[in-house]
């Protein structure tokens, strides 16, 4: 059942990176508008993106309240200009989204190498601790704050003159690696949540190489 001349939304898809979370759907509306509702499994429905002609709705503010909860959304279709109209069952047409658990499913954003410093044959590489939109005590939490030791970083590093990539790992945001004296190295990092089965890894950070401005070299 449903409203005359409206079609139900379909292909409801969660797009989420570092907890910035948007629900997308189809089709582009023709003479209809949409309203989105979201709830946890045990909670009440909350309406968002009222009577919109968009086919996406930013639900970040709702999911960051508890990123470990599982959320369900639904998209209601209404005839444009007659949003009070309901179908024969007395309720507008709607479609449910897949369930979404932000902590387990949000994509890990591309990390950034903040700095690297060489001291003799050791290099300290620091990964930027990216800020998320998750709040605690009115403060935005970093990715490390949210994931704790569940989040690790893999460092790929290689001599500028060579192709083989060595790896190092950390459950902080810092690496301390051994390098050969007099050699220039390049670095790239990847965020990983090993306990996950899907969306385990981020894309790689941009490559940073020694001899560029981000680094600092000290001969000891």
């Amino acid at each position: 059942s449903g409203t005359t001349n409206t079609v139900a939304a379909y292909n409801l898809t969660w797009k989420s990176t570092n907890f910035k979370t948007i629900l997308e759907w189809e089709p582009k509306p023709v003479n209809q508008v949409y309203t989105v509702q979201i709830s946890t499994k045990s909670g009440d429905w909350k309406s968002k993106c009222f009577y919109t002609t968009d086919t996406e709705c930013d639900l970040t503010d709702e999911i960051v309240k508890d990123v470990k909860q599982t959320y369900l959304a639904r998209v209601f279709s209404y005839p444009a200009g007659n949003v009070e109209s309901t179908g024969s069952a007395g309720e507008p047409l709607y479609e449910n989204s897949p369930e979404f658990t932000p902590y387990l499913e949000t994509n890990l954003g591309q990390p950034t190498i903040q700095s690297f410093e060489q001291v003799g044959t050791k290099v300290n590489v620091t990964v930027e601790d990216e800020r998320t939109l998750v709040r605690r005590n009115n403060t935005f939490l970093s990715l490390r704050d949210v994931f704790g030791k569940d989040l690790i970083y893999t460092l790929y590093y290689w001599k500028s003159s060579s192709s083989g990539k060595k790896t190092a790992k950390t459950n902080t945001n810092e690496f301390l690696i051994d390098v050969d004296k007099g050699e220039n190295y390049c670095f790239s990092v990847q965020a990983v949540i090993p306990s996950r089965t899907v969306n385990r890894k981020s894309t790689d950070s941009p490559v940073e190489c020694m001899g560029q401005e981000k680094g600092e070299f000290r001969e000891i």
């Epitope: 690790i152 893999t154 790929y156 192709s163 083989g164 990539k165 060595k166 790896t167 190092a168 790992k169 950390t170 459950n171 051994d178 790239s188 990847q190 990983v192 090993p194 996950r196 089965t197 899907v198 969306n199 385990r200 890894k201 894309t203 790689d204």
Partner: antibody, heavy 120, light 106 residues
Framework: EVQLVESGGGLVQPGGSLRLSCAAS????????IHWVRQAPGKGLEWVGY????????YYADSVKGRFTISADTSKNTAYLQMNSLRAEDTAVYYC?????????????WGQGTLVTVSS | DIQMTQSPSSLSASVGDRVTITCRAS??????VAWYQQKPGAPKLLIYS??FLYSGVPSRFSGSRSGTDFTLTISSLQPEDFATYYC?????????FGQGTKVEIK
């Protein structure tokens, strides 16, 4: 169920080439690192090399560097070991193994192995 | 490359015995050490991060670390435990294995 299945082994003459495949099921290889490990008859385990299928990064043991190439096809969920300029000492059972990319990176799943014999 | 020196290379023991195998890393590897069991066929993971029991592995297997020394202990050897055991470090690339310890029936 997580599974790794190697294929492509066989008898090859010294100087010859062979390509081994490692077909994965039950997980997506782009989320992990895939290693190749070999074991000569009656000997211990020797690491050969790895690939991160998400970016194509590789690293090889000195004993195979320049002769062996690891690649991956994420659409087929399969990793490959291309072996060129084969020598008698490359005779071994070749295993692929999954690295969960945690801090200690244990190889949590292994294939059954495929035997490569280099002999004239 | 980091060397993993495993000892003994073989040992004979009886069912019910307590068995200890050690591995010494040539430099610091933190806790990035795993232990594998191999019967004919592919190795199987027993212990990871030096002391964590892998899922489905009997609790008679345990691992410990003291500095660069790592130990695999089988508290009470069972008939199915007769096999070859390998340690492995993956603290740095390349990962390296110990030479193996063959546990045989006395």
């Amino acid at each position: 169920e997580v599974q790794l299945v190697e294929s492509g082994g066989g008898l090859v003459q010294p100087g010859g080439s062979l390509r081994l495949s490692c077909a994965a099921s039950g997980f997506t290889i782009s989320g992990y690192i895939i290693h190749w490990v070999r074991q000569a008859p009656g000997k211990g385990l020797e690491w050969v090399g790895y690939i991160d299928p998400s970016n194509g990064y590789t690293y090889y043991a000195d004993s195979v560097k320049g002769r062996f190439t690891i690649s991956a096809d994420t659409s087929k969920n399969t990793a490959y070991l291309q072996m060129n300029s084969l020598r008698a000492e490359d005779t071994a059972v070749y295993y692929c193994a999954r690295d969960d990319q945690s801090l200690s990176s244990p190889f949590d799943y292994w294939g059954q192995g495929t035997l490569v014999t280099v002999s004239s | 490359d980091i060397q993993m020196t495993q000892s003994p290379s073989s040992l004979s023991a009886s069912v019910g015995d307590r068995v200890t195998i050690t591995c010494r890393a040539s430099q610091d590897v933190n806790t990035a050490v795993a232990w594998y069991q191999q019967k004919p066929g592919a190795p199987k993971l027993l212990i990871y991060s030096a002391s964590f029991l892998y899922s489905g592995v009997p609790s008679r297997f345990s691992g410990s670390r003291s500095g660069t020394d790592f130990t695999l202990t089988i508290s009470s050897l069972q008939p199915e435990d007769f096999a070859t055991y390998y340690c492995q470090q993956h603290y740095t690339t390349p990962p390296t294995f110990g030479q193996g310890t063959k546990v045989e029936i006395k």
